[in-house]
């Protein structure tokens, strides 16, 4: 879980390590802070649950490019 | 942290084309979203265009829709922006930029610059 004590530098210290359903998520955003130990991804579900997780995995990748998708018609 | 580094600017005469280039440091690559933004003198920042991380998708502002084109390499850590026929009205100094959450064409939605580089079409 994210974890934001010394707000306002959030971060990631354990991924989850279950694929999530696009369809539970409502956003994300980028963790690159140089003081969190790990770059990370934290999406947000439908019901205001943040889980963090591995930007290299490409599930991660694709549910990211989704989420944009949703917010945007492509002009492939 | 992604450090970005544009090629590409020049003078042209309308009609002609141009190709940019941004390649990018870091180990990530693929799993940021890429845009292009332009800024023209006394303007604002202004979305161009942006691309998915699997580069499936390309999304474009209306005023380069058909002429403009963006494309990336995963494997070379490197984005591109085809411009052709282009107009005056396409001066500006060019970005491009690597995502930090959802919103694609908003500035902020973007948390890596490059430096950016000189686009001059003269009539």
């Known amino acids: 879980q994210p974890d934001a004590i010394n707000a306002p530098v959030t971060c990631c210290y354990n991924f989850t390590n279950r694929k999530i359903s696009v369809q539970r998520l409502a956003s994300y955003r980028r963790i690159t802070s140089s003081k969190c130990p790990k770059e990370a991804v934290i999406f947000k579900t439908i019901v205001a649950k943040e889980i963090c997780a591995d930007p290299k995995q490409k599930w991660v990748q694709d549910s990211m490019d989704h989420l944009d998708k949703q917010t945007q018609t492509p002009k492939t | 942290e992604v450090q970005l580094v544009e090629s590409g600017g020049g003078l042209v005469q309308a009609g002609d084309s141009l190709r940019l280039s941004c390649a990018a440091s870091g180990r990530t690559f693929s799993s940021y979203r890429m845009g292009w933004f332009r800024q023209a003198p006394g303007k604002e920042r202004e979305f161009v265009a942006a691309i998915s991380r699997s580069g499936a998708s390309a999304y474009y502002a209306d005023s380069v829709k058909g002429r403009f084109t963006s494309s990336r390499d995963n494997a070379k850590n490197t984005v591109y922006l085809q411009m052709n026929k282009l107009k005056p009205e396409d001066t500006a100094v060019y970005y491009c930029?690597?995502?930090?959450?959802?919103?694609?064409?908003?500035?902020?939605?973007?948390?890596?610059w490059s430096q950016g580089t000189q686009v001059t079409v003269s009539s």
């Open positions: 930029a690597a995502s930090s959450r959802i919103g694609v064409d908003d500035p902020e939605a973007y948390g890596y």
